[in-house]
């Protein structure tokens, strides 16, 4: 496939990455396929710069990221190892909290107001980020 | 100007199969996702699959799944609808269509007919 | 899936005359609706996105309001060309979903 040299349209370049900050909320699920959809991926937080960088555009809204454990571990969405990676949770975050009386309970993970990440339900209609990376040969599967 | 040319549309008995194509111009066919949507004569719009930019990421409606297929081939800037196993139902006009950044059509083509009858 | 439903299903209208079009959500899809206009044996054209902002082209009489589960198209002042079929879009969620349609004619 082809391969990536320059973001596209509307995104910002950071890092050999590209970044589109949605302004429009959707539930975890559905801005998972928003980004897969523009052949991307919620956003892999892997170094405090980047954390940074991500929170300095999406100011004090709640944002979702790539990260969650609806099927029992921590697992970002693009494979980066949860357990040695970068991590930067609100204190006593994550919780998986069941009192919010929507069911079940916490499995997505978003950016809090001040940046922090916390574990949250995953209908509720965040902002998002996507994120794909410069230089990456692209999906495109062969021709047959 | 962006122009989406379907063909590929004619009569097919009940279990056959057809290939519809879209040809597209006058934007940047590998940047955008594109979609198909029927309807059904004398009924409303019903959105059938997308197929992602690269062509790595698709979804289809549950009516669709598991017998049509989308792809795309960016060399020759056209989008393709592989259908197999026909149903009466499935019957409609397929307009294939860029899908936006915002989730919604912005240009169509004329559409191609497809009948399913025995 | 997301339903959507559309009032009235078909309106008859003149000329001048100010027309509103509801679209409903069966669950909240915050601002992500389009609006299109489908004359008979054409393609839709996109009128409206984002539930309230004006596609590039289209004339300022069309308007979009409403957010979550309730939104209306509104057409001020209704021209010869604006007879047709209008339906609504949700692009919150897989599959995506239209109304049924609203249909103006002339009265």
């Known amino acids: 496939g082809s391969e990536r040299t320059c973001c596209p349209v509307n995104w910002v370049e950071h890092e050999r990455s590209c970044y589109w900050f949605s302004r429009s909320g959707k539930a975890w699920a559905d801005a998972d396929n928003y980004c897969r959809l523009e052949d991307a991926h919620l956003v892999v937080v892997t170094s405090w710069e980047e954390q940074k960088f991500v929170q300095h555009h999406i100011g004090p809204v709640n944002t979702w990221m790539g990260l969650h454990d609806q099927n029992g571990p921590w697992k970002w969405v693009d494979g980066t190892d949860y357990e040695t990676g970068f991590k930067n949770w609100r204190p006593e975050q994550p919780d998986d909290w069941y009192g919010h009386g929507l069911g079940g309970g916490e499995d997505c993970a978003h950016f809090t107001d001040d940046g922090r990440w916390n574990d949250d339900v995953c209908q509720r209609p965040y902002r998002w980020v996507c994120e794909t990376e410069l230089d990456k040969a692209s999906q495109e599967p062969p021709l047959l | 100007e962006v122009q989406l040319l379907e063909s590929g549309g004619g009569l097919v008995q009940p279990g056959g199969s057809l290939r519809l194509s879209c040809a597209a111009s006058?934007?940047?066919?590998?940047?955008?996702?594109m979609s198909w949507v029927r309807q059904a004569p004398g009924k409303g719009l019903e959105w059938v699959s997308v197929i992602s930019g690269s062509g790595g990421s698709t979804f289809y409606a549950d009516s669709v799944k598991g017998r049509f297929t989308i792809s795309r081939d960016n060399s020759k800037t056209t989008l393709y609808l592989q259908m197999n196993s026909l149903r009466a139902e499935d019957t409609a006009v397929y307009y294939c269509a860029k899908r936006d950044w915002n989730d919604v059509f912005d240009y169509w083509g004329q559409g191609t007919l497809v009948t399913v009858s025995s | 899936d997301i339903q959507m439903t559309q009032s009235p299903s078909s309106v008859s209208a003149s000329v001048g005359d100010r027309v509103s079009i509801t679209c409903r959500a069966s669950?909240?899809?915050?601002?992500?609706l389009a609006w299109y206009q489908q004359k008979p044996g054409k393609a839709p054209k996109l009128l409206i996105y984002a539930a309230s902002s004006l596609q590039s082209g289209v004339p300022s009489r069309f308007s979009g309001s409403g957010s979550g589960t309730d939104f209306t198209l509104t057409i001020s002042s209704l021209q010869p060309e604006d007879f047709a079929t209008y339906s609504c879009q949700q692009g919150n969620s897989f599959p995506f979903t239209f109304g049924p349609g609203t249909k103006v004619d002339i009265k």
């Open positions: 006058g934007f940047t066919f590998s940047s955008y996702a």
């Open positions: 669950q909240d899809i915050s601002n992500w």
